[in-house]
């Protein structure tokens, strides 16, 4: 056959149903490779055409949309099972042509299968609610375009394996799960389930998310830099090593990048020429306020090492500090022999 | 679609026990609970228990508990429903019913056991 | 166990009557209430799931409402065919536990 602008497969998009389940699949080609959309496709006399290569197997073939009850079908772009088999798992190709054009690309669908309390191989998307912070809401996702808004479903929201009924600050409000007051113990994975008629069947729809609640930007500050600080004073004779550890409280904000680095007389470590080494360790609260700590490590340090200045920086959303640490040359302690025997006047 | 087909009507005697089968088609079997419900003659209706064949966890009301054991076969699609020590009050239509959440969407057609001397 | 109280037992309505069965949950269930319609000598059918939510297939003239502990299953329109008993089961706290049924029948 004829040249074909093949997008290879898209594992970006590795698309996870549960088994049993309606899904409706969107081909890819016209949301992340391609400048125009189905409609502008489909006027210009482009047509969709689907195929798959099931588990374990090299053989492309194509999709079988006459199955009892239209359990496969296609409408527009949009590829719908009604519902899901395990055995549905494989990767599937979309290829937009006509006798001129030709596009596709494939990608990876997984049909998984749940246990009764919900858990299962899905990656969980997480949500994230600042502690103590009044009413939070979260959303059932991905339940647009299942049913018309003339269908009014059911949704059962779920905490792990239980009903969310008489909760004292969670409260299910239909696609909505209210939290009054978000706290430590609302971490968890919350799963809602959406029951809706079509054509005299019953269908389920299940989300599962993870909850996790985190530092309020009410309560937060400016790094903190905990070492170095000004009782401590690293005193050193040259040839020993000189450790130095930066100490960082962050507090937990949303899409802030925090930063620790160190410079010396000025420099970053990389630009001068002496051996230094940084590690950093990261550490996280109950609420992910962030502790990082890099430790500047001189194995041998010389009399001019001892006199350079060291400086620790942190910098976050909320601010950027920087503190030196105190460096000296350690005074050598007296020899008995020769200094203390002068002292009693020994000739 | 979705089936439940239970095995046929059995006669026991007093204290022994009686295995019921209830064959599903027509959906994901793993995927869903299956509860078992009785009935006495002429009376309504009473929930025994269920169970998730994908991962075989179960639940039983506290009257059955110990009497009755609930399994499920994932490669026939079958779930069974063992009551011992079988009592004259024992004698009932004893139903499976399919749900993928709580509510029992499915029902198999009953089968009566009657236990009698 | 939650109790299910079931009224009336029994009733007796002509063809095109709107019709009203009740149901008291002796806590509160959350909506979690299904109602059963088992015709004489079959299975019970779901009819209603979560106090209000029409299962696929039933006839719109049946509709659920209720909330608490008092629950109303309405038949809009008696139907020759609605002849049945109906229960409501709650699935708030197991063990599931049903009504003890109400008896339709036509006048």
């Known amino acids: 056959s004829e040249r074909c602008d093949d997008w290879g497969l898209d594992t970006m998009r590795q698309i996870q149903v549960f088994e049993d389940e309606p899904a409706r699949i969107k081909c890819p080609l016209f949301e992340h490779f391609l400048k125009f959309n189905y409609s502008t496709a489909h006027s210009a006399g482009l047509t969709l055409i689907w195929y798959w290569t099931r588990q374990d197997r090299d053989l492309e073939e194509p999709i079988n949309f006459r199955l009892p009850e239209n359990r496969i079908s296609k409408e527009k772009d949009v590829l719908w099972f009604r519902p899901t088999l395990l055995n549905d798992t494989g990767n599937y190709t979309c290829m937009l042509r006509n006798t001129t054009y030709c596009s596709k690309v494939a990608f990876p669908l997984e049909v998984v299968q749940k246990d009764s309390c919900f858990n299962s191989p899905m990656k969980l998307p997480v949500h994230k609610l600042y502690i103590e912070y009044g009413i939070q809401r979260i959303t059932c996702p991905n339940v647009d375009g299942y049913f018309p808004s003339s269908v009014k479903p059911t949704i059962t929201w779920y905490m792990g394996c239980y009903k969310i009924q008489n909760f004292n600050n969670v409260i299910p409000e239909g696609m909505n799960l209210s939290f009054l007051i978000a706290l430590i113990s609302n971490n968890g994975n919350y799963t809602c389930v959406v029951t809706y008629p079509e054509n005299g069947r019953t269908f389920h729809l299940t989300r599962t998310l993870t909850v996790k609640v985190v530092g309020s930007p009410k309560n937060a500050v400016p790094p903190v830099i905990h070492s170095p600080n000004d009782h401590v004073v690293y005193e050193k004779e040259p040839g020993e090593e000189l450790l130095i550890p930066c100490t960082v409280y962050f507090s937990f904000l949303m899409d802030s990048r925090n930063e620790v680095w160190w410079t010396i007389d000025g420099k970053k470590p990389d630009d001068i020429t002496i051996d230094v080494t940084i590690n950093e360790s990261i550490s996280h609260s109950r609420t992910e306020d962030e502790t990082r700590t890099q430790i500047l490590s001189i194995k041998k340090v010389t009399s001019e090492d001892l006199k350079r200045s060291y400086v620790c920086h942190a910098r976050s959303a909320k601010g950027e500090v920087a503190k030196a640490a105190k460096v000296k040359q350690k005074v050598p302690a007296p020899r008995y022999t020769v200094e203390l025997a002068c002292g009693f006047g020994a000739t | 679609q979705v089936q439940l087909v239970q095995s046929g009507a059995e006669v026991k005697k007093p204290g022994s026990s009686v295995k019921v089968s209830c064959k599903a088609s027509g959906y994901a079997f793993s995927s869903s609970w299956m509860n078992w419900v009785r009935q006495a003659p002429g009376q309504g209706l009473e929930w025994m228990g269920r169970?998730?064949?994908?991962?075989?966890?179960?639940h039983y009301a506290q009257k059955f508990q110990g009497r009755v054991t609930l399994t499920a076969d994932k490669s026939t699609s079958t779930a069974y429903m063992e009551l011992s020590s079988l009592r004259s009050e024992d004698t009932a239509v004893y139903y499976c019913g399919e749900g993928y959440l709580d509510p029992m969407d499915y029902w198999g057609q009953g089968t009566l056991v009657t236990v009698s001397s | 166990d939650i109790q299910m109280t079931q009224s009336p037992s029994s009733l007796s309505a002509s063809v095109g009557d709107r019709v009203t069965i009740t149901c008291q949950a002796s806590?509160?269930?959350?909506?979690?209430l299904n109602w059963y319609q088992q015709k004489p000598g079959k299975a019970p059918k779901l009819l209603i799931h979560y106090t209000s939510g029409l299962h696929a297939g039933v006839p719109s003239r049946f509709s659920g409402s209720g909330s608490g502990t008092d629950f109303t299953l309405t038949i809009s329109s008696l139907e020759p065919e609605d002849v049945a008993t109906y229960y409501c089961q709650q699935y708030s706290i197991l063990p599931w536990t049903f009504g003890g049924g109400t008896k339709v029948e036509i006048k």
């Open positions: 169970i998730y064949p994908g991962d075989g966890n179960t």
């Open positions: 806590q509160g269930i959350n909506n979690y």
